[in-house]
């Protein structure tokens, strides 16, 4: 079973003498999700050659995965804490439909996929408490998400494998960008 944040994990140092601060909790939580993604990527790469494929652009056309850009205020040049937090939360909310898609894509790591999805929901809640400008956060339309999910699930096997690989790779990159930006706050 997946190790929950707060329990022993390979990327957590000596126990804290005091309760975790909000920033520390968020940081630890992201690292926990990254652990989960790592496990899921292992299974994906073991069962298909998607991780070495050069045909990623074909599948990427169907996806609109959130990505950090300079205008989002999370990069050092033009860093803006409020704008950046809005981008992080909005991006995580946009990833939720893709994490839902991943739920039936794993055999041996089914629990891990669920843990990544649930931990992301918790992370969004942590970050929403930290954000001042909640009005600026746009939540994806449920109907849009539902039709996107249907479309993704209707793809052929090769495209579904490629989509799984791309979601995991992009989510990992997005979380790494989050980790970096949040540590500057």
């Amino acid at each position: 079973a997946p190790v929950l944040p707060g329990e022993d994990s390979k990327n957590v140092a000596a126990p804290h003498s005091q309760p975790l601060t909000s920033s520390e909790r968020i940081d630890k939580h992201i690292r926990y999700i990254l652990d989960g993604i790592s496990a899921l990527r292992k299974e994906t790469c073991n069962r298909s050659n998607m991780c070495e494929s050069s045909k990623e652009a074909l599948a990427e056309n169907n996806l609109n995965l959130p990505k950090m850009a300079e205008k989002d205020g999370c990069f050092q040049s033009g860093f803006n804490e409020d704008t950046c937090l809005v981008k992080i939360i909005t991006g995580l909310l946009e990833f939720e439909v893709y994490l839902e898609y991943l739920q039936n894509r794993f055999e041996s790591s089914e629990e891990q996929a669920r843990a990544v999805q649930m931990s992301t929901k918790v992370l969004i809640q942590f970050l929403q408490k930290k954000a001042k400008n909640l009005d600026a956060i746009t939540t994806p339309e449920p109907t849009t998400n539902a039709s996107l999910l249907t479309k993704l699930q209707a793809q052929n096997q090769w495209l579904q494998d490629m989509t799984t690989h791309l979601i995991l790779r992009s989510f990992k990159e997005f979380l790494q960008s989050n980790l970096r930006a949040l540590r500057q706050m």
């Epitope: 990327n11 990254l34 990069f75 500057q184």
Partner: antibody, heavy 122, light 107 residues
Framework: QVTLKESGPTLVKPTQTLTLTCSFS??????????VGWVRQPPGKALEWLAF???????YYSPSLESRLTITKDTSKNQVVLTMTNMDPVDTATYYC??????????????WGQGTLVTVSS | DIQMTQSPSSLSAFVGDGVTMTCWAS??????LNWYHQRPGEAPELLVF???NLQIGVPSRFRGSGSETYFTLTINSLQPEDSGTYFC?????????FGGGTKLEIK
């Protein structure tokens, strides 16, 4: 096998601009979580971090030197370039480039170049 | 900026001895602390990342510990090749900062 190597002038005159190139192999600077940094060490002194560039082109500079530094990358050539303007004798040091690459962004430099000694003198 | 302070600035010990050096951060950095070893005329080498994780290939006689603002590096059963200078590094946030170093002499 991951390797990095610094190249550039060994001697520069005061007020001149120093351009150092870090050529690397064994990894890609387009992989998420990967970055390359520059660190210098004046003779007999401690390490001083100068600049850092990430896979997505996010750049960080030492606040005390920011106005003089520029870091850029050429992913296709596997190179990172550092320029430092208005060189002064106190900038005499061994300049290292180093790689950081881990999922959790621990900002740890796991592989270093051999370093290049730059002397600033007229 | 986060200031890093190392103590002692130098120490000497015999082969087979154990030593401990410390590093303080001016504010909490969680477990984001790295240790490096540098021999004269050579580039630094990563020993420990994230306060307590040994870098691949580093002997188990090295041990890092600590969190928040106080960190230690312990070397058991010293070997001649352990001589040199040890640097700690704030890896929590930019600007990255190094400690002044601890110079270890093996007698």
């Amino acid at each position: 096998q991951v390797t990095l190597k610094e190249s550039g002038p060994t001697l520069v005159k005061p007020t001149q601009t120093l351009t150092l190139t870090c050529s690397f192999s064994g990894f890609s600077l387009s992989t998420s979580g990967v970055g390359v940094g520059w660190v210098r060490q004046p003779p007999g002194k401690a390490l001083e971090w100068l600049a850092f560039i990430w896979w997505d082109d996010d750049k960080y500079y030492s606040p005390s030197l920011e106005s003089r530094l520029t870091i850029t990358k050429d992913t296709s050539k596997n190179q990172v370039v550092l320029t430092m303007t208005n060189m002064d004798p106190v900038d005499t040091a061994t300049y290292y480039c180093a790689r950081s690459a881990d999922d959790y962004l621990y900002y740890s430099f796991d592989t270093w170049g051999q370093g290049t000694l730059v002397t600033v003198s007229s | 900026d986060i200031q890093m302070t190392q103590s002692p600035s130098s120490l000497s010990a015999f082969v087979g001895d154990g030593v401990t050096m410390t590093c303080w951060a001016s504010q909490s950095i969680n477990d984001y602390l790295n240790w490096y070893h540098q021999r004269p005329g050579e580039a630094p080498e990563l020993l420990v990342f994230a306060a307590s994780n040994l870098q691949i290939g580093v002997p188990s006689r090295f041990r890092g510990s600590g969190s928040e603002t106080y960190f230690t590096l312990t070397i058991n059963s010293l070997q001649p090749e352990d001589s040199g200078t040890y640097f700690c590094q704030n890896a929590h946030s930019f600007p990255l900062t190094f400690g002044g170093g601890t110079k270890l002499e093996i007698k």
